[in-house]
């Protein structure tokens, strides 16, 4: 009898531990990636930022993958995605090619199965960075809640990448899973 | 036999209740702190904002502590941190000394064990607030996902604090725990 | 004896499944609503945006209701609310009535039981959109953590709605439940 009871208990324990693991104890995926300033592209047009840190300073990743400049989803779910992008210019860096700038960020999702890329979030501003001021700065923040499937890739594009602030507290993006897909 | 079964059941209940408590039912820490406008410091350089409400209007706190102008972490975990900072000037507000303003926010983490302070997030903009307009406004929003340890402190620094909008919907910061550290 | 044990197990299973359901397995409410550009109001003063998509493209909703331009809470809890609002003007759209603009967003909560409306979050900027540039753009992002009760309604107001960017990646708002109210 006692052995039977223990077997029943093991079944109960096992099932609910399994469920609890699936529910919350399974490490929820997340990433916080910070700009790798050693490899920022040049130009003023929209370019994809491919160099990000994932394991130094504030940068970290768990149950997601960073590869070829893209954040790859390993687990289906609803995720909150965010990006913070800072641009700056000091007169000691030399003259700007133009005082009228379009400082933008685009957070995009790429599906490998059906090769396609779509912008999930965008933000930014047109700015007039006049020579009357020796220093200019501008930051963009975007965030939103999206359904992501395993294998999908998140990337970040910006205009005027040469103006990016290279600090880890300034230019970063990330994601964290909030809940499963029903 | 019946007594034995009840004891086994109690063990099962106890263990999984304990786990469930650790998992999700344990109240996840959060805070949403709104600016206390009765005590905004002056200055043009970066100053720490130490007066925040934690228990009136939209302001609230749970399983975190607010002390000496800092939000103290009581529970290890990964948290989403955010701040919204609004600056404004009306011609009746006072004699603005410069049109060229650097309106910035810095969200910092201080570790008491290893006395050090580091900026987690920054945002803002340089602005030209001309006298040709009677009213000026600008808001900054930053957010990000960070690993925080018990005892660490989160604080907010801004430039030009006398330009802060004192409304609870305008100037606030907060945090909520998303998941445990593995 | 065996029947008794099964009954006990059913009790254990039942209670903890019920608790797990309440805890996390119950689908946590969320919404991500994108602007419906076919019905954007005109004017430069603060207006409520009532036309949003909830089931096309990135727009989605679960365990919340969208009705009469408002996002209705169906489940008490603490929610993270966010909004991203983009404004733009191209010279081909015609001349602006004024070059001095106040581009603002207000995320409000309305309680039906006690008829009242309160702003939870605001953001934006005054802008000088000069005729010297053919294109102007500006985005606002706000986010915060709030206690919401079943039946309460979330809505979004903006100034200068005719300048809104109608793209789904540009102008949206949303919410997701993070935790229960203790």
């Amino acid at each position: 009898g006692s052995q039977h009871i223990r077997a029943e208990k093991a079944m109960v324990d096992g099932s609910w531990l399994d469920l609890a693991k699936r529910s919350k104890l399974e490490a929820q995926p997340f990433a916080h990636l910070t700009i790798n300033a050693t490899d920022i592209p040049t130009g003023s047009h929209k370019v994809s930022l491919s160099s990000w840190y994932h394991d130094r300073g504030w940068a970290k990743i768990s149950n997601m993958t960073f590869s070829n400049g893209k954040l790859i989803v390993n687990q289906d779910g609803f995720y909150y995605l965010y990006a913070n992008i800072c641009f700056r210019h000091h007169e000691t860096s030399g003259d700007l090619a133009t005082e009228y700038l379009q400082l933008m960020v685009y957070v995009t999702k790429t599906s490998i199965k059906i090769p396609s890329s779509h912008t999930l979030m965008k933000g930014g501003s047109t700015k007039y960075w006049s020579g009357n001021s020796e220093f200019h700065f501008y930051s963009i923040n975007v965030g939103g809640f999206f359904k992501l499937r395993s294998g999908e890739e998140i990337s970040v594009e910006v205009s005027n990448p040469s103006l990016l602030d290279p600090d880890q507290d300034a230019t970063y993006f990330g994601a964290f899973k909030v809940r499963d897909i029903d | 036999g019946s007594q034995h079964i009840r004891a086994e059941k109690a063990m099962v209940d106890g263990s999984w209740l304990d786990l469930a408590k650790r998992s999700k039912l344990e109240a996840q820490p959060f805070a949403h702190l709104t600016i206390n406008a009765t005590d905004i410091p002056t200055g043009s350089h970066k100053v720490s904002l130490s007066s925040w409400y934690h228990d009136r209007g939209w302001a609230k706190i749970s399983n975190m502590t607010f002390s000496n102008g800092k939000l103290i972490v009581n529970q290890d975990g990964f948290y989403y941190l955010y701040a919204n900072i609004c600056f404004r000037h009306h011609e009746t507000s006072g004699d603005l000394a410069t049109e060229y303003l650097q309106l910035m926010v810095y969200v910092t983490k201080t570790s008491i064990k290893i006395p050090s302070s580091h900026t987690l997030m920054k945002g803002g903009s340089t602005k030209y607030w001309s006298g040709n307009s009677e009213f000026h406004f600008y808001s900054i929003n930053v957010g990000g996902f960070f690993k925080l340890r018990s005892g660490e402190e989160i604080s907010v620094e801004v430039s030009n604090p006398s330009l802060l909008d004192p409304d609870q919907d305008a100037t606030y910061f907060g945090a909520f725990k998303v998941r445990d550290i593995d | 004896g065996s029947q008794h044990i099964r009954a006990e197990k059913a009790m254990v299973d039942g209670s903890w499944l019920d608790l797990a359901k309440r805890s996390k397995l119950e689908a946590q409410p969320f919404a991500h609503l994108t602007i419906n550009a076919t019905d954007i109001p005109t004017g430069s003063h603060k207006v409520s945006l009532s036309s949003w998509y909830h089931d096309r493209g990135w727009a989605k909703i679960s365990n919340m209701t969208f009705s009469n331009g408002k996002l209705i809470v169906n489940q008490d809890g603490f929610y993270y609310l966010y909004a991203n609002i983009c404004f733009r003007h191209h010279e081909t759209s015609g001349d602006l009535a004024t070059e001095y603009l106040q581009l603002m967003v207000y995320v409000t909560k309305t309680s039906i039981k006690i008829p009242s409306s309160h702003t939870l979050m605001k953001g934006g900027s005054t802008k000088y959109w000069s005729g010297n540039s053919e294109f102007h753009f500006y985005s606002i992002n706000v986010g915060g953590f709030f206690k919401l009760r079943s039946g309460e309604e979330i809505s979004v107001e903006v100034s200068n709605p005719s300048l809104l960017d109608p793209d789904q990646d540009a102008t949206y708002f949303g919410a997701f439940k993070v935790r229960d109210i203790d």
């Epitope: 009357n132 | 000394a97 049109e99 060229y100 006398s162 | -």
Partner: antibody
């Protein structure tokens, strides 16, 4: 060396006009708000006008509002005070003063010129 | 307008003495007070701002304190070169107003 040099003072009849100038050197003039402060013979200091760093904001006390106009030319590193409808009580040494960096709404003065004397008398 | 009342209007002290001047504002100005030194025939010089902060290059014998409406300026050990008139100024709200001055002389 940081320097402010006033000029343009002199004797003027009541109801007359005068334009004071202040030449700045040794610092980035365009970055600073500036003011004029006066001192009547044997009396204390009185602030009479201020101008923001970019020149789009101008400020006056009620005693001179509508009569005095402050302006600046950042390209020439120069500050001006146009004084109209002068009265006997406007007789004073007029100092050009640089507002120190600090809170954007607070004005105190870290660099002063030697002053120029304005006498209003018939 | 905020009125600034300075006292005394004049004082006489010996070299090495501790000298204290007070300034009273007609309303709360927090800590927005500056102190200036003006020697005869010269322009004023900034000594203290924000009630207690010494300006660059100002000797440590000069100090300031106070908040709200009552402020104190102190010369811890009077030196011959300190002979001057001292003015307080509120920098809290426009119009920026000065005290009437305190003339410091050597006995």
């Amino acid at each position: 060396e940081v320097q402010l040099v006033e000029s343009g003072g002199g004797l003027v009849k009541p109801g007359g006009s005068l334009r004071l100038s202040c030449a700045a050197s040794g610092f980035t003039f365009r970055n600073y708000a500036m003011s004029w402060v006066r001192q009547a013979p044997g009396k204390g200091l009185e602030w009479v006008s201020g101008i923001s760093s970019g020149g789009t904001y101008t400020y006056y006390p009620d005693t001179v509002k509508g009569r005095f106009t402050i302006s600046r030319d950042n390209a020439k590193n120069s500050l001006y005070l146009q004084m109209n409808s002068l009265r006997a009580e406007d007789t004073a040494v007029y100092y050009c003063a640089r507002r120190d960096y600090g809170d954007v709404y607070e004005w105190y003065f870290d660099v002063w010129g030697k002053g120029t004397t304005v006498t209003v008398s018939s | 307008d905020i009125q600034m009342t300075q006292s005394p209007s004049s004082l006489s002290a010996s070299v090495g003495d501790r000298v204290t001047i007070t300034c009273k504002a007609s309303q709360d100005v927090r800590t927005s007070i500056a102190w200036y030194q003006q020697k005869p025939g010269k322009a004023p010089k900034l000594l203290i701002y924000s009630a207690s902060y010494r300006y660059t290059g100002v000797p440590s014998r000069f100090s300031g304190s106070g908040s709200g409406t009552d402020f104190t300026f102190t010369i811890s050990s009077l030196q011959p070169e300190d002979i001057a008139t001292y003015y307080c100024q509120q920098h809290y709200s426009s119009p920026w107003t000065f005290g009437g001055g305190t003339k410091v002389e050597i006995k």
